[in-house]
Interface confidence: low
């Protein structure tokens, strides 16, 4: 099974040693999250201090099973959840269509070799879209009025501004843009190494080593269960390292 | 209380077909996937193949052309028919409950239904 | 198809000794074995998932361990009880297969 065999290195994780130690590691996730409702949210959770092997992660909601990144066998969304759940990234999971029922607990278990299990809380709140959301498509062309009229203003000033100003000057704004930007983009949740063979990669066929030499239905009913889809969004859990 | 109950026909001719049924409480079959396993005398396990709880299928390559197995989850049953079948099917045959959640490991066996095939 | 190879065929031992089964898979599977004991004229019964993970309702001397290729079931004091066939079974990939089995017998 070529497309599974690859260790977690992106959770931190190599191959453990078979003698039982103390529970060691520790689950990070993100938290009490809030999203509105018809949004999506990604859950996310990272387990870090441990070198134990992770054999397969669940996704559950309060006691109903989510979806499934399982070092063998890949990817499993939940039949009831199969059109509102999307795999990754990572080992994480994407909630689409959010409606309020979807507030609640949420668990990442990770089955890890040898420590056993550790589990992970998050807590979603699904808001209703406000008033004034719904009320703002009706003010959509009164505001791109406005921030047009703000954009000449505001370009016109710079340009005036600009003029006035030395080379050097711009060169400092230049400067303090771009950290700006490098600030912003380290906001966003990420694991803690990195993501390229991450445990769960990226791959844009279904995996042949479910199947084998068996072709025919059976081969792609296989392939609909796992939920492994062709498309380069969703990937394979990939745990173990590949020895032939 | 978890339980899954065959009931077969227990004598088979050669060459004519098996049908049994997996009767199943406790548990719905909209959740868990059932497998069908079989013995034969003095020797080991043999997994045959799986329903999942979608209804989908995946076989043992070495049975494919002649197993089926079907469900009717209202009912809590699943069904397995094997054709032609010959003195070497001779079996105990168990349904078992299997699951992604257990990644495979058979939870629940039933107690197995006796098949022999003889004329 | 995995092939699981399990040995010894048959294991003597004395109540109260410690045992251990082997298991070994023709290819990786990582810790995708599960371990079964199947009393005379019984069903079999799951002991140990995921190689080492233990089972709710099965006594704690039933351990399981090893990864990769490589699988033991032990039970560290045996009782008259466990007298009984071992079996593993691999889930890492399709169809599903279990080994031959190992005997346990009193001596």
């Known amino acids: 099974m070529r497309w599974c065999l690859l260790l977690i290195w992106a959770q931190g994780l190599r191959q453990a040693p078979l003698a039982s130690g103390m529970m060691t590691g520790t689950i990070e996730t993100t938290g009490n999250i809030s999203a509105e409702k018809g949004g999506s949210i990604i859950l996310q959770c990272h387990l870090s201090s441990t070198t134990a092997q992770v054999t397969q992660v669940n996704w559950e909601q309060q006691d109903q099973l989510l979806a499934i990144c399982n070092a063998d066998l890949g990817w499993h969304i939940s039949p009831s959840f199969k059109d509102r759940v999307a795999p990754g990234p990572g080992l994480g999971l994407t909630l689409q269509s959010l409606t309020v029922n979807d507030t609640g607990e949420y668990f990442c278990i990770y089955h890890t070799y040898p420590d056993g299990t550790y589990t992970g809380r998050i807590f979603l709140e699904v808001l209703e879209s406000s008033v004034a959301e719904h009320g703002a498509r009706f003010q959509i062309p009164l505001l791109g009025a406005m921030a047009a009229t703000l954009v000449v203003i505001c370009t016109a000033v710079i340009v005036v501004v600009a003029l006035t100003r030395k080379k050097k000057a711009l060169r400092i704004h230049s400067v303090e843009g771009d950290l700006r930007r490098k600030s912003a983009g380290q906001e966003e949740w990420s694991p803690s190494a990195p993501s390229p063979p991450g445990s769960c990669v990226q791959a844009e066929a279904a995996p042949a080593g479910l199947c084998g030499e068996q072709r025919g239905e059976d081969c792609a009913e296989l392939h609909d269960y796992f939920n492994v889809l062709s498309y380069r969004s969703l990937g394979n859990c990939s745990f173990f390292t590949e020895t032939g | 209380q978890v339980q899954l109950k065959e009931s077969g026909p227990g004598l088979v001719a050669p060459s004519q077909s098996l049908s049994i049924t997996c009767t199943v409480s406790g548990f719905s079959l909209t959740s868990y996937d059932i497998s069908w396993i079989r013995q034969p005398p003095g020797k080991g396990l043999e997994w045959l193949g799986v329903?999942?709880?979608?209804?989908?299928?995946n076989y043992n390559s070495a049975f494919m052309s002649r197993l089926s197995i079907s469900k009717d989850n209202s009912k809590s049953q699943v069904f397995l028919k094997m054709n032609s079948l010959q003195t070497d099917d001779t079996a105990i045959y168990y349904c078992?409950?299997?699951?992604?959640?257990?990644?495979?490991?058979?939870?629940?066996w039933g107690q197995g239904t006796s098949v022999t095939v003889s004329s | 198809d995995i092939l699981l190879t399990q040995s010894p065929a048959i294991l003597s031992v004395s109540p109260g000794e410690r045992v251990s089964f082997s298991c070994r898979a023709s290819?990786?599977?990582?810790?995708?074995i599960h371990w079964y004991q199947q009393r005379t004229n019984g069903s079999p019964r799951l002991l140990i998932k995921?190689?080492?993970e233990s089972i709710s309702g099965i006594p704690s001397r039933f351990s399981g361990s090893g990864s990769g290729t490589d699988f033991t079931l032990s039970i560290n004091s045996v009782e008259s009880e466990d007298i009984a066939d071992y079996y593993c079974?691999?889930?890492?990939?399709?169809?599903?297969?279990f080994g031959a089995g190992t005997k346990l017998e009193l001596k």
């Open positions: 290819q990786n599977i990582g810790t995708s």
């Open positions: 078992v409950r299997s699951t992604m959640i257990t990644h495979y490991a058979m939870d629940y």
């Open positions: 995921y190689a080492f």
């Open positions: 329903i999942w709880t979608g209804g989908g299928t």
């Open positions: 079974q691999q889930s890492n990939s399709w169809p599903l297969t």
